[in-house]
Amino acid sequence: SDKLYQRKEPVISSVHTKVKGIAEVTENVTEGGVTKLGHSIFDTADYTFPLQGNSFFVMTNYVKSEGQVQTLCPEYPRRGAQCSSDRRCKKGWMDPQSKGIQTGRCVPYDKTRKTCEVSAWCPTEEEKEAPRPALLRSAENFTVLIKNNIHFPGHNYTTRNILPTMNGSCTFHKTWDPQCSIFRLGDIFQEAGENFTEVAVQGGIMGIEIYWDCNLDSWSHHCRPRYSFRRLDDKNTDESFVPGYNFRYAKYYKENNVEKRTLIKAFGIRFDILVFGTGGKF
């Protein structure tokens, strides 16, 4: 409740997160008439990426382009990229939509289509749909520990969300355990009224709000966080206009002394932790 006599100041905060969980992934890669089923285990180092600020990312899906090498090859025949003669291809041209620099030659991409040859990481990335269901859909059961230290410098008061009495095996629940700072990812989505399985396919951005409403007067002292959750990305975005949340990264290796890479388009959930509130004292 707003106490008009109190001197209030905004919270200063730092956040640290730790994600835990193991996913077993079975992926189908079909090329050249062979569907290869691969079974792999993903641990924290495989699916989380360090982000700056109060954010963490959990990969829930991916598309791989394996065995790429820097050379010349036909570019992917996306809409408007096909050619019938060299006239259509400009040497040295870098189309922002393309994956390389054109050589000026129009070459066969497959039996029926020709595209401009490019100097690039080859074969160039295909425009593939994100797998459905998501490959790491079991990330729903991962947990995240959120450590939040706060400070009110004007009142010379510091505290944190984790109390010495807290049980390390607890899981946050709005009713049964609202002070537990270990959150199951699926529960975060449920609380926000979202379907994890669906969002996991293309990715998205989820907000974890930590609200501190602190009364620092000794006679009625109260300073504990309240957690709430809401989706931050626009889930109603037209499917054709960059839905979800994804980025690309590469794993580099050498094969027969040739540098190669596996390009990974990672889809996932970026969790933004938003800490706000005030501390009031007479």
Partner: nanobody
Framework: EVQLVESGGGLVQTGGSLRLSCAAS????????IAWFRQAPGKEREGVSI???????FYADSVKDRFSITADGAKTTVFLQMNSLKPEDTAIYYC??????????????????????WGQGAQVTVSS
């Protein structure tokens, strides 16, 4: 019309080698993957090796490092070089064109994409 004709089968001693050939007509190896399957008396048919239409090779765990699948330059004939043969390699070997599944060292036909095209088979007998 798609046709596959195997040759090169025969009788060989344990530890010996054989080279099977599969002559393909009515299609090119750019259209399908080619695999070798085998069936021993009283046993289920098992996939041995695949050559994908983009040139990747796959082997069943039972033949890895002993068998090798290749194609000729014209991509009309596929070969299965079999070394260090064992009595348990005795079977009828079939050449198959189609779509396949490779799962942790096991090879099977991708029946969702059809039953493939099969040759008549070549007998391989390994005596001890």
């Amino acid at each position: 019309e798609v046709q596959l004709v195997e040759s090169g089968g025969g009788l060989v001693q344990t530890g010996g080698s054989l080279r099977l050939s599969c002559a393909a007509s009515g299609f090119t190896l750019d259209d399908y993957a080619i695999a070798w399957f085998r069936q021993a008396p009283g046993k289920e048919r098992e996939g041995v090796s695949i050559l994908s239409s983009i040139g990747k090779t796959f082997y069943a765990d039972s033949v890895k490092d002993r068998f090798s699948i290749t194609a000729d330059g014209a991509k009309t004939t596929v070969f299965l070089q079999m070394n260090s043969l064992k009595p348990e390699d005795t079977a009828i070997y079939y050449c198959v064109a189609g779509h396949f599944v490779y799962n942790d060292g096991a090879i099977s036909l991708n029946t969702a994409r059809g039953s493939g095209f099969w040759g008549q088979g070549a007998q391989v007998t390994v005596s001890s």
